[in-house]
């Protein structure tokens, strides 16, 4: 190889071991018959060099920087050339290096050909190896603007008083251009701008100078998006840092076009302005630091433009003035990522704020708007407590649980309704009155309806679920000691034609100390399956439940376990069952953790069953499966 | 491994030659150069010569008019010839690899050479 | 030729302490981007072992207490923290263009 640099080109080109392979044959340049590491080769001189080694591309890089001077003359504008051309040189992985000093009145602006340019964060990579480091210069200090790929939306970046430009070209790439070139402009009196233009749905993800390391003390850097008209861009935040300020306050300053508060600043923890129509631009502006503990004041963000969708036009209103002590969240239902672009699902308060999930409280009318190719990609969370502080006045109290039909309109699925229903410890108990009879949840029965109760302790301390209901059973009500949470899951869309199905009161009445009691009324058409509360972890250490089941007059009820034995082995007290005819008090007791189970039993009056646990050994848990079915009577034994 | 040996005669009469072979093992002589160190009792090291890879040789021009180096590849041996010894020649001859950047990363024992009658 | 001229002809130092040998050569050095300065140990009976090549990279097996600066004509050789074994002779020397020089020495002790 022969490397020729012209007098007066202010070029250095530098070959120098790259990282080492593990490769076991070393690779030297060879030179006058010696044998070096490294060549450097400065303007006006020849240098004839070969290699020892067939692949140098393995062992070695060259390096090729450009000092451009344009404070003591004329600085040459224009298309920026690779010089030497990549042909002259050995097919190592090759960085160009163009490092501009200018003084601080001078702007300097890096205009990219197409494709754009795309910045990457720490430990990315571009897919085709073609890197572009920027860096600019305040005093003499250097600040990383960023590291790019090609194929984005970055178009112009303006910096003044210098700038340094690195190209990465692996060994086998083919580009023999920089794909750029320098302009001046005037003072932009700020550390630098960067113009990123999109031209149709995408998305752009930014950084602050020198992520993710501390953007420079009391700073301003400038982002300016060229959106279509027709298209709406949302900025969200990824991940940020303040630092401590001293004076001052770190901020996010947006220029909206048709915006009356221009500039609109925000906080960095404040949500992002969404929606937004045409071009805009956002200014990071930093503060002055605390001298012994300056923190770091550091944004990665990203900025999604799509289409409008039809119901970002449409308003509407969420009306909870009239509610108390409730929540309602928007936000994304869980799903798989795919690597497509995928446009951004937001919901907007006043059209204007809008991000991936909001939460709504009570007390306040809400105007809300979507800004969302997809709405099933979206779903809503509501949770609102119930709670009584004085027995004296809520005892025989009831309220309806039902979603508010404003809830109901939305055009975002409901996933779950949560009443948190908390009463006096030892004061009072509830019970759950549903508008249709329910139906327990089992594996040998399940739910098919588009909507189910889950009802469960919301004692902290207690892990105690009762199950799972929906419409259609047998259970008139369910009786609980003390506080627990009513969830109304959704499963289907259908929910909103189902919706009239709902309905369940709740009433605060005389305490009581079994921890829940179901009563059951079964149809005479059907098999009742009820299990014991907690399945698959079994029933807390000393619970006590009950079923009040109902015998009508003209059947009899049979009453069947689903194992032998109970399986439960007791560490501390005894697991013992009662079955106890109502009308003649005759009770038989078994011993949970010793006896079978009883035979199949027939009853001819209502009849109650008690479970009652000991604390039992871990692994060894009491879950217990049964079934009621009536059926005709055939002998009056009365 | 990388090793030199050198050997020679050990007792070299004033006005006679000298003859030292260095034989090489672990790397190639058409890959690396072999330079001649020399070390009087007491004193430093003085640079003899060297013969490069291919095979072009290098002397100290003190001592150009009497000296002369030479390999064979494929014995993988570099041989020192000098002429008119005296007993200021009295010293420790090296040979020692030129590996890159010019440093002389591997050396022989040595081969102590005296000059007396 | 290019003349090394070694600096102290000897030192000693207490064990953990800094040494600090320095070579001046007549002329640079560098040459393709390269300072062409080694540096070698040798102790009594034995051949010079290679310290430091290219003025600052250490050679294969060499413990990192070794270290080497400098650029054009002045280059100097540390050791830090001094050990027992460190008592040697050192010599510098260029390899920018033949005939290939050597410094003096400089004889290492300990105090």
């Known amino acids: 190889f022969e490397i020729a640099l012209p007098r007066e080109s202010n070029i250095t080109v530098l070959i120098k071991l790259g990282t080492p392979t593990l490769l076991a044959k070393p690779c030297y340049i060879v030179i006058s018959k010696r044998h070096i590491t490294m060549l450097s080769i400065k303007s006006g001189e020849r240098i004839v060099f070969t290699f020892s080694c067939q692949s140098p591309e393995n062992h070695f890089v060259i390096e090729i920087q450009k000092n451009i001077d344009c404070m003591s003359g004329p600085c040459p504008f224009g298309e920026v050339q690779l010089q030497p051309s990549t042909s002259l040189l050995p097919t190592l992985n090759r960085t160009f290096i163009w490092d501009v000093k200018a003084h601080k009145s001078i702007g300097l602006e890096l205009q990219f050909s197409i494709p754009r340019l795309r910045q990457i964060g720490p430990g990315e990579s571009c897919p085709d190896g073609v890197t572009h480091s920027i860096s600019g210069r305040i005093d003499a200090t250097v600040v990383r603007i960023g590291t790019f790929c090609s194929n984005g939306t970055v178009s112009r970046i303006k910096m003044q008083e210098g700038v340094k430009m690195a190209l990465h070209l692996p060994w086998f790439h083919p580009r023999n251009v920089s794909g750029f070139s320098i302009a001046n402009r005037s003072s932009i009196k700020r550390l630098c701008i960067i113009e990123s233009v999109f031209e149709g749905e995408g998305s752009a993800t930014l950084m602050s100078a020198n992520y993710p390391e501390g953007f420079p003390e009391d700073e301003l850097m400038t982002w300016q998006f060229v959106v279509p008209a027709h298209l709406r861009a949302s900025v969200s935040f990824l991940n940020f840092n303040l630092s401590n300020c001293e004076r001052k306050e770190e901020r996010v300053e947006y220029y909206i076009p048709g915006s009356t508060t221009n500039p609109e600043v925000f906080k960095l923890e404040d949500k992002q302005p969404g929606n937004m129509a045409g071009n805009f631009n956002l200014s990071l502006q930093g503060c002055d630091q605390d001298a012994q503990s300056p923190g770091i004041l550091r944004l990665q963000f990203q900025v999604l433009v799509q289409h409008p969708q039809n119901e970002s036009n449409k308003i509407y209103v969420v009306d909870l003035s009239n509610e108390r002590a409730m929540s309602l969240t928007i936000e994304p239902r869980p799903v798989k990522q795919s690597r497509k672009f995928v446009p951004g699902c937001f919901v907007c308060l006043e059209s204007r704020t809008c991000s991936s999930n909001l939460t709504l409280t009570s007390g306040s009318k809400h105007k809300i708007s979507f800004l969302c190719d997809d709405l099933t990609r979206l779903w809503m969370n509501v949770e609102k407590t119930i709670s009584c502080t004085d027995h004296r006045y809520c005892q025989r109290k009831s309220y309806s649980l039902q979603v508010p039909s404003d809830i109901l309109h939305l055009p975002v699925e409901l996933h779950d309704f949560s009443w948190k229903l908390l009463v006096p410890k030892d004061r009072l108990s509830l019970v759950l009155v549903p508008a249709q009879k329910l139906q327990q949840h089992t594996h040998e029965k399940p739910c098919n309806t588009s909507f189910s109760y889950l009802v469960a302790s919301a004692i902290p301390s207690q892990d105690l679920y009762f199950g799972s209901f929906c419409p259609g059973g047998s259970i008139k009500q369910i009786q609980v000691k003390q506080n627990i949470s009513v969830t109304l899951r959704t499963f289907a869309p259908s929910f909103q034609q189902e919706a009239s199905r709902q309905g369940l009161t709740v009433s605060f009445i005389p305490y009581f100390k079994e921890e829940g009691v179901f009563t059951v009324t079964p149809d005479t058409k059907s098999k009742v399956y009820l299990r014991t509360p907690n399945w698959d972890r079994g029933l807390p250490s000393l619970t006590s439940v009950s079923w009040n089941i109902s015998v009508p007059r003209d059947q009899v009820a049979c009453l069947t376990f689903f194992k032998e034995r109970s399986g439960v082995v007791c560490q501390t007290g005894r697991a013992f069952m009662i079955i106890q005819e109502q009308r003649t008090r005759a009770e038989e007791i078994f011993s949970l953790d010793e006896d079978v189970l009883p035979k199949p039993s027939f009853h001819h009056h209502s009849f109650w069953v008690n479970i009652s646990n000991c604390s039992p050994t871990s692994g060894k848990q009491l879950d217990l499966l049964f079934s009621v079915t009536l059926t005709p009577r055939t002998v009056d034994l009365t | 491994e990388v090793q030199l040996q050198e050997s020679g005669p050990g007792l070299v009469a004033p006005s006679q030659s000298l003859s030292i072979t260095c034989t090489v093992s672990?790397?190639?002589?058409?890959?690396?150069?072999v330079n001649w160190v020399r070390q009087p009792p007491g004193k430093g090291l003085e640079w003899l010569g060297m013969?490069?890879?291919?095979?072009?040789?290098d002397y100290n021009s003190a001592l150009k008019s009497r000296l002369s180096i030479s390999k064979d590849n494929s014995k993988s041996q570099v041989f020192l010839k000098m002429n008119s010894l005296q007993t200021d020649d009295t010293a420790r001859y090296y040979c020692?690899?030129?590996?890159?950047?010019?440093?002389?990363?591997?050396w022989g024992q040595g081969t102590s050479v005296t000059v007396s009658s | 030729d290019i003349v090394l001229t070694q600096s102290p002809a000897s030192l000693a130092v207490s064990l953990g302490q800094r040494a600090t040998i320095s070579c001046r050569a007549s002329?640079?050095?560098?040459?393709?981007?390269?300072?062409?300065m080694n540096w070698f140990q040798q102790k009594p009976g034995q051949p010079p072992k290679l310290l430091i090549y290219?003025?600052?990279n250490q050679g294969s097996g060499v413990p990192a207490r070794f270290s080497g600066s400098g650029s054009g004509t002045d280059f100097s050789l540390n050791i830090h923290p001094m050990e027992e074994d460190d008592t040697a002779m050192y010599f510098c020397?260029?390899?920018?263009?033949?005939?290939?020089?050597f410094g003096g020495g400089t004889k290492l002790e300990i105090k």
């Open positions: 013969i490069w890879g291919d095979g072009s040789t």
């Open positions: 020397q260029q390899s920018k263009e033949v005939p290939w020089t």
């Open positions: 672990g790397f190639s002589l058409t890959g690396y150069g």
């Open positions: 290219a003025a600052s």
């Open positions: 020692a690899r030129d590996g890159y950047d010019g440093a002389m990363d591997y």
């Open positions: 002329e640079s050095v560098d040459n393709y981007g390269i300072s062409f």
